[in-house]
């Protein structure tokens, strides 16, 4: 598989936003790349979000996606929003070179994202 690198650990902000870079070593000159973020928890793997982009163009997730991102060469900067403590888990970056053939696939080792829910503000008298 292709080599895919991502940070081991990221701490989400108090607003439930986590960002990390997913970098892949492309064997050649792909023009169409698909990036998928997967969440692994208790051996269950679920898709968080996915985007296909043309090299040199912006990364576009669906409008209702909790992910946003930008791309630069073989690097993708991913941001996941709306995270809560229960979303703490291992987030895996999957990269596929879709075009031109051949197809290449790479899976990162995962980024452990820790999310801490903010303490509610105390009522002021």
């Amino acid at each position: 598989a292709m080599h895919v690198a991502q940070p081991a650990v990221v701490l989400a902000s108090s607003r439930g936003i986590a960002s990390f870079v997913c970098e892949y070593a492309s064997p050649g000159k792909a023009t169409e790349v698909r990036v998928t973020v997967l969440r692994q928890a208790d051996s269950q793997v679920t898709e968080v979000c996915a985007a296909t982009y043309m090299m040199g163009n912006e990364l576009t997730f669906l409008d209702d996606s909790i992910c946003t991102g930008t791309s630069s060469g073989n690097q993708v900067n991913l941001t996941i929003q709306g995270l809560r403590a229960m979303d703490t888990g291992l987030y895996i970056c999957k990269v596929e070179l879709m075009y031109p053939p051949p197809y290449y696939l790479g899976i990162g080792n995962g980024t452990q994202i820790y999310v801490i829910d903010p303490e509610p503000c105390p009522d002021s008298d």
Epitope: A1, A25, P27, L38, Y103, I107
Partner: antibody, heavy 115, light 107 residues
């Protein structure tokens, strides 16, 4: 048009050696990982070896059945990949295909190992 | 190495039938699965890559599905020219092994 043309097959005695070649054209050879796959008579497809390209430091991988006996190599200046096959056994008989990361395939070359 | 279990080993169906072939892997391969068609005396032909993507020039009768460890190749309406042996292959591993094959015949 993409083309992969294997050559070098033939009859070889058990314990002998043979070298297969695969000449590629119609795509950017140096951008791709190259593989050898075989099909023995009455058997299924068997992946044998892979050589990656320059960004991957030409890493090589082998199936357990050929490791230590077969060597894959490539010459990007000649758009060619090779399979050096040593210590051949009768069970190595089959049609050998080269493939550019399984998207493009050659027509195959027959290797027969027999005394 | 990742083990590939393909079933059935052979299959006989009628023209127009919907045909499914399955492939199970010994561990999660994250959709890194290809399907091939091989006709006697011909080179293997890539049908589906990345579990669900139709290769260029392949009839839309063919489709792939699945994730994790379970994958399926479906032929929506079997045609006489589909007689062949079909193989799955794990492309995630550095040792990209094939399934044992499914020989498809027409009744």
């Amino acid at each position: 048009e993409v083309q992969l043309v294997e050559s070098g097959g033939g009859l070889v005695q058990p314990g002998g050696s043979i070298r297969l070649s695969c000449a590629a054209s119609g795509f950017t050879f140096s951008d791709n990982w190259m593989n050898w796959v075989r099909q023995a008579p009455g058997k299924g497809l068997e992946w044998l070896a892979q050589i990656r390209n320059k960004p991957y430091n030409y890493e090589t991988y082998y199936s357990a059945s050929v490791k230590g006996r077969f060597t894959i190599s490539r010459d990007d200046s000649k758009n060619s990949v090779y399979l050096q096959m040593n210590s051949l056994k009768t069970e190595d008989t089959g049609v050998y295909y080269c493939t550019a990361q399984f998207a493009y395939w050659g027509q195959g070359t027959l290797v027969t190992v027999s005394s | 190495d990742i083990q590939m279990t393909q079933s059935p080993s052979s299959l006989s169906a009628s023209v127009g039938d919907r045909v499914t072939i399955t492939c199970r892997t010994s561990e999660n391969i994250y959709g890194g699965l290809n399907w091939y068609q091989r006709k006697p005396g011909k080179s293997p032909k890539l049908l589906i890559y990345g579990a669900t993507n139709l290769a260029s020039g392949v009839s839309s009768r063919f489709s792939g599905s699945g994730s994790g460890t379970d994958y399926t190749l479906t032929i929506s309406s079997l045609q006489p020219e589909d007689v062949a042996t079909y193989y799955c292959q794990n492309v995630l591993s550095s040792r990209p092994g094939f399934g044992s094959g499914t020989k498809l015949e027409i009744k």
